[in-house]
């Protein structure tokens, strides 16, 4: 049966009508409109953009569009007391200072309110000391330094290159190592692709370009002062000393011209191996401190940023469902940017805008979706996913009872090579089927499907003839919906060729050079990749909101659960002696996965056969599908991470951006050989196996026949 049969509409109003209404030229126009001035969270400019989007969504035909405001903790540099880093001589004189701002790109010289590069939520401070180079500041980098090289970071200022992991994890690792300050820099090895020119002549990072970003370790808490609850007018706020996730040492980002000046003088130990060397003409010595001639010189940080409770605004648009208005499919992406937001977020916001316009056009012609669609323009994503999290905290009771799916819509592009999708296994078949119906925008794939080009360029490592779909991690606004509330979630964007481009993210990420021109000149002049992403995101929303039976396949969850159980068992088996000593068995987990597989298979058979004209039975089956993701939520959360409650997936404890499977067991096993009390440590492994096995079994039972 076609999707449109649910709402008695003319055949014209189907998925094709929705997709055909999406236009590349409109996305281009919207992107231009959203990127002419900065839209930093908490500023008047971003409030004005919120009101503009509210007004336009109303014009497009949504039933209602409201602003939802919250007063949350944000962070800004001091306008009269800039942040910088110095090299000081033995007399304390500053003999070198890092730049105070990025040279503005052509055409933007007279734009006001460009926030200078800073690490949001850094505490104030002016630490001085010897420098230690810590590579990417990953967990394994500090293991190498401390355990193998016997280098002590205590009381030192560490310098780390951006890339590989979320910057907040770098800062946390540096704090735990005893550092008294952190300098983050972009190395050309990670942010300068060979054979491409620097902006404005290409899409590479110039030496004066700097990546902004927050350095929080919120673990899903949202506003640091109101964890678990909305930051509304009557909120009780924690004192700053009790705030969640704030760093305790000063942090500041710099570009590679300034990094060169700091790194070229480094002495002490040589880099342990080639993986610690970037592309600058410096030795990449680890330190501590400068080499012989410069050994009396020190590094000093000057950080004067302030944390301020500030009002933020989400825009929430509603298109009421005709048949199941109490079932919500949500499309959300953020609006706030560090500066112009040419890619992050406005390439996503422009796509959402065009999707809303297309849905609105259909609605004006008499169509309605079967289920309610909510559209969201989130604020303060860059400051820790604050807008989405506060709204979800405020509406958690509705969302946990009515939330069908959340589709994220941040940056539409991070490259122009192929599609990239991260989603719940429930959506695998939806994504496969949809991409088979869409045309590929890729050169050399004219007349071929998106599925075909995607599979060719990004094949699944496990299943031949299928594309790679990744686990959801975090670092974006789906976090609260998926990791806290257990609402099936997904995200899609166009990405680079990870095989040939080893740099992290895209070179101009969070810099002043992320402009409209960057996209229009270098990434997507025809906006064909943006259009494809609009079709994928919009098509997923359309199907989720309009198909009679929810387009979720629980059998795909069974497949990945087996894969994840195998993986975690294999990790544990690196310690066979201890497993034997402490009687560690994964039998309960494998047994639960086996039961899940059998029950999911039977449920899928019933799903094919039941009477879809019976609205009660239809609703019952759909509810079992909707609530399956919810069944993986443990109300107690993960150890020390109460807002990460999904037992199958959580952001990695070592990299917020990455997803980890069976995270409770994984974290219990991590570095277990170094634990002071092995009996306690292996006891926690056994407890986590128990929690995982119980949760998988309990989830399986939600798919059993109800009586």
């Amino acid at each position: 049966k076609s999707s449109n049969e649910a709402t008695n509409i003319t055949p014209k109003h189907n998925m094709k009508a929705f997709l055909d209404e999406l236009k590349a030229e409109n996305i281009k126009k919207f992107l231009y409109n959203f990127t002419q001035i900065p839209h930093l969270a908490g500023t008047e400019q971003n409030f004005q953009l919120a009101k503009q989007i509210q007004s336009q969504w109303k014009e497009f035909g949504l039933d209602s569009v409201e602003l939802a405001h919250y007063d949350v903790l944000l962070s800004y540099p001091n306008k009269t007391h800039p942040n910088y880093i110095s090299i000081i001589n033995e007399d304390g004189n500053e003999i070198f200072n890092t730049s105070l701002f990025e040279p503005p790109p052509p055409g933007y010289e007279n734009v006001s309110d460009i926030v200078p590069p800073f690490s949001a939520f850094s505490p104030q401070g002016m630490p001085e000391g010897d420098l230690v180079y810590v590579n990417y500041a990953r967990t394994e980098d500090f293991f190498k330094l401390e355990r193998d090289m016997k280098i002590n970071c205590s009381g030192k200022i560490v310098i780390a290159r951006y890339g590989k992991v979320f910057r907040g994890n770098k800062v946390k690792n540096a704090q735990l190592a005893g550092a008294k300050g952190v300098i983050l820099y972009s190395d050309p090895a990670d942010y300068f692709a060979p054979g491409v020119k620097s902006y404005p002549d290409g899409w590479n990072l110039p030496g004066g370009g700097v990546q902004r970003g927050n350095i929080l370790n919120l673990n899903g808490a949202g506003d640091p002062l109101t964890p678990g609850y909305p930051a509304n007018e009557y909120a009780y706020r924690r004192g700053i000393a009790e705030a969640v996730g704030l760093p305790s040492i000063p942090v500041h980002p710099i570009g590679y011209y300034d990094a060169q000046k700091l790194l070229e003088k480094m002495g002490g130990s040589a880099p342990p191996d080639s993986s610690w060397r970037g592309s600058l003409k410096v030795p990449y010595n680890v330190g501590p401190g400068f080499t012989g001639n410069f050994s009396t010189q020190k590094v000093k940080m000057h950080i004067h940023s302030t944390n301020e409770v500030t009002r933020i605004y989400n825009v929430i648009g509603t298109l009421r469902g005709a048949v199941e208005p109490d079932r919500y499919v949500i499309l959300g992406g953020h609006r706030d940017s560090w500066v112009f937001g040419g890619i992050d977020p406005q390439s996503g916001a422009a796509v959402v805008h065009e999707i809303v316009r297309s849905f609105g056009t259909l609605k004006k012609e008499g169509w309605r979706p079967r289920r309610t669609i909510l559209f969201a323009s989130w604020d303060a994503e860059e400051f820790g996913l604050l807008g989405s999290t506060e709204w979800a905290e405020e509406n958690s009771r509705l969302l946990q009872e009515r939330g069908v799916a959340y589709i994220n819509a941040d940056s539409s592009i991070e490259g122009n090579y192929t599609l990239r999708v991260d989603c719940t296994p429930l959506m695998y078949s939806l994504v496969h089927n949809l991409t088979k119906e869409l045309k590929s925008p890729d050169e050399g794939f004219e007349g071929k499907s998106l599925y075909e080009s995607w599979t060719k360029k990004s094949p699944s490592p496990e299943f031949s003839g299928m594309p790679r779909i990744s686990k959801l991690g975090s670092g974006n606004d789906f976090e609260v919906f998926f990791q806290r509330l257990g609402i099936a979630s997904g995200r899609a964007r166009y990405t680079k060729n990870w095989e040939t481009n080893k740099f992290s993210g895209y070179p101009l990420y969070h810099s002043v050079y992320e402009t409209y021109e960057l996209v229009e000149k270098f990434y997507d002049p025809m906006f064909k990749y943006h259009l494809t992403v609009a079709q994928v995101r919009g098509g997923m929303v359309f199907e989720l909101a309009n198909s009679i039976v929810l387009p979720f396949d629980c059998r795909d969850y069974a497949v990945v659960l087996r894969k994840y159980a195998d993986k975690i068992y294999s990790i544990s088996m690196k310690h066979p002696q201890e497993m034997k000593t402490y009687s560690v068995s994964f039998d309960s987990l494998f047994s639960a996965v086996k039961n899940f597989t059998e029950i999911a298979s039977k449920f899928s058979e019933r799903l094919q056969d039941f009477d879809k004209s019976n609205p009660i039975v239809l609703r019952m089956m759909n509810d079992q599908l909707m609530f399956l993701e919810r069944a993986f939520i443990d109300p107690l959360g993960l150890p020390d991470r109460p807002f990460y409650r999904h037992v199958i997936y959580a952001p990695s404890s070592h990299n917020k951006y990455a997803g980890e499977s069976f995270p409770g067991i994984y974290d219990a096993l991590f570095d277990i050989e170094s634990k002071v009390d092995p009996s306690k440590a292996w006891g926690e492994v056994k407890r986590q196996i128990y929690v995982a096995a119980f949760t998988v079994q309990a989830a399986a039972e939600t798919l059993s026949e109800v009586a």
């Epitope: 068992y569 310690h575 002696q577 034997k580 560690v584 068995s585 994964f586 039998d587 494998f590």
Partner: nanobody, 120 residues
Framework: QLQLQESGPGLVKPSETLSLTCTVS????????YYWGWIRQPPGKGLEWI?????????YYNPSLQSRVTISVDTSKNQFSLKLSSVTAADTAVYNC????????????RGQGTLVTVSS
């Protein structure tokens, strides 16, 4: 009484593939209650699990060796085999095949072991 016996060359050149076979006698390899595994002990170091397989051919590999290891089973011959590619001197060890209870590390039977030296 169950017995396991490893066989294969004792000397392998660097960059080549190490191949060992384990023959099981006194019992059937086709039991869902057990996995059949390979473990090794380099000189002066602790025991390292390489990987395991069940009677249906489902494999589990040590993540740090995964890219180089293949374990296969031949139920008709009551044998299972190990292939470890691109070997280096660090792969020099006594290699044992063993049986362990499914989903655990309870090795109840193991072969006597065979020393494999990687050297040119």
């Amino acid at each position: 009484q169950l017995q396991l016996q490893e066989s294969g060359p004792g000397l392998v050149k660097p960059s080549e593939t190490l191949s060992l076979t384990c023959t099981v006698s006194g019992g059937s390899i086709s039991s869902s209650s057990y996995y059949w595994g390979w473990i090794r002990q380099p000189p002066g170091k602790g025991l390292e699990w390489i990987g395991s397989i069940d009677y249906s051919g489902y494999t589990y590999y040590n993540p740090s060796l995964q890219s180089r290891v293949t374990i296969s089973v031949d139920t008709s011959k009551n044998q299972f085999s190990l292939k470890l590619s691109s070997v280096t001197a660090a792969d020099t060890a006594v290699y044992n095949c063993a049986r362990h209870k499914a989903a655990t590390a309870d090795f109840d039977y193991r072969g006597q072991g065979t020393l494999v030296t990687v050297s040119s």
